[in-house]
Amino acid sequence: EPHSLRYNLTVLSWDGSVQSGFLAEVHLDGQPFLRYDRQKCRAKPQGQWAEDVLGNKTWDRETRDLTGNGKDLRMTLAHIKDQKEGLHSLQEIRVCEIHEDNSTRSSQHFYYDGELFLSQNLETEEWTVPQSSRAQTLAMNVRNFLKEDAMKTKTHYHAMHADCLQELRRYLESGVVLRRTVPPMVNVTRSEASEGNITVTCRASSFYPRNIILTWRQDGVSLSHDTQQWGDVLPDGNGTYQTWVATRICRGEEQRFTCYMEHSGNHSTHPVPSGKVLVLQSHWQHHHHHHGLNDIFEAQKIEWHE
């Protein structure tokens, strides 16, 4: 997977008046890395590994960049004409990537009230606008303002592209991101399924990087794909990832099944617990919104199985 740096800024308006603050998060390689602390007006690292990336250097540069970006985005929101009464948001997501072959990609996306209305490839400067008439109107509004603003010239977009990549390279130079491995915690649980069957679930959590093999084996042989159900590999909010795999087996055959895990060159096998085990089973539903705002994980029900 490519290395990536992702800036996510949001500004708000109320009854047509742009609010003074802004929300900002920065993700490094898909992990929460920086957050703008509105109380202290400073960029703050998210967790120990983020602090380790810069070592003893200060976060002044990041604070300055985020503050400047927030100010630009507030000005952009002020120029959006169709602001009706009530609360509205303008969100900018900027991403740059360095791929294994050293090629780079950079893009910028604008969302109004959670709806994508304008994208730009920062390398080719090519703009993309969704088909809807609302998006077309918003995009015209914003593009006109950006053209008027002397700061938003051709060189500005090249600079945004270059700055993002420069920061990404600076973070990667520390070696913390490249070297970082956190082994998963693996947990196997069982729950009642239909008569004579049980569902066995293998969960891997708190691991980094995100690449992992998690599969059920029967007698040491991997079960076919269609007999297993996999969860997505998702961030768990601590700078690490989580995932799961489940399958249905016949009661009494538990000893034949093991969960096999492989991560960052290490592997392990985990048997199915025998007997009656008390299992807290959470059913998580993943709502995927394409507006770039936070994904929602909704705990639908929690059941005790005995």
Epitope: D219, V221, Q255, T258, H267
Partner: antibody
């Protein structure tokens, strides 16, 4: 490449016991199960049991419970099968085998001939 | 235990001839759990076909497998001298794993 090298032939007296070894190389030993199979002279194959080298967990053919004990030594990447209270019925070639994760007995050792005779 | 019955027990074929060996299970098994092995005289068994129809690494394309439920077969498209061996089917569906009694293939 994956190789399973078994210990040499054994001639043992009835009532005695024997330990057959199977040294694995060419792959991460704890990644895949080791299976044991018996082949009596001129006969078919019989599965004895298997062991997961990572955690030592075993699954055995009921017929060989009490007869065969499966163990591993992770430090030397070696699996062992201990056969006790030997009788002439136990005279056979014993094979160890391992998997590639997709089929049961993908790779086989060369076999160990155990002869029980007074 | 699942009993696997192979037929024929022995057979002789001429080079170039098409060979079919059958394996009948005493109870139904999923095709994912049926494998075939070849054992040449004085050697260890060798995996030939796994999961009913998948050729193991290095196995010539003249070998093929098919079947479902209780009835499975191994086919050699054109018999060659080096195919002289005993062939075993094996099930991994239920414990204990069992092997067929073997089919000894000779050359005419």
């Amino acid at each position: 490449q994956v190789q399973l090298k078994q210990s040499g032939p054994e001639l043992v007296k009835p009532g005695a016991s024997v330990k057959v070894s199977c040294k694995a190389s060419g792959y991460a030993f704890t990644k895949y199960n080791i299976y044991w199979v018996k082949q009596s002279h001129g006969k078919s194959l019989e599965w004895i049991g298997y062991i997961d080298p990572y955690n030592g967990g075993t699954v055995q053919n009921q017929k060989f419970k009490g007869k065969a004990t499966l163990t591993v030594d992770k430090s030397s990447s070696t699996a062992y099968m201990h056969l006790n209270s030997l009788t002439s019925e136990d005279s056979a070639v014993y094979y160890c085998a391992t998997t590639d994760g997709y089929s049961l007995f993908t790779y086989w050792g060369q076999g160990t001939l155990v002869t029980v005779s007074s | 235990d699942i009993v696997l019955t192979q037929s024929p027990t022995t057979m002789a074929a001429s080079p170039g001839e098409k060979i079919t060996i059958t394996c009948s299970a005493s109870s139904s098994i999923s095709s994912n759990y049926l494998h075939w092995y070849q054992q040449k005289p004085g050697f260890s068994p060798k995996l030939l076909i796994y999961r009913t129809s998948n050729l193991a690494s290095g196995v010539p394309a003249r070998f093929s497998g098919s079947g479902s439920g209780t009835s499975y077969s191994l086919t050699i498209g054109t018999m060659e001298a080096e195919d002289v061996a005993t062939y075993y089917c094996q099930q991994g569906s239920s414990i204990p794993f069992t092997f067929g009694s073997g089919t000894k293939l000779e050359i005419k």
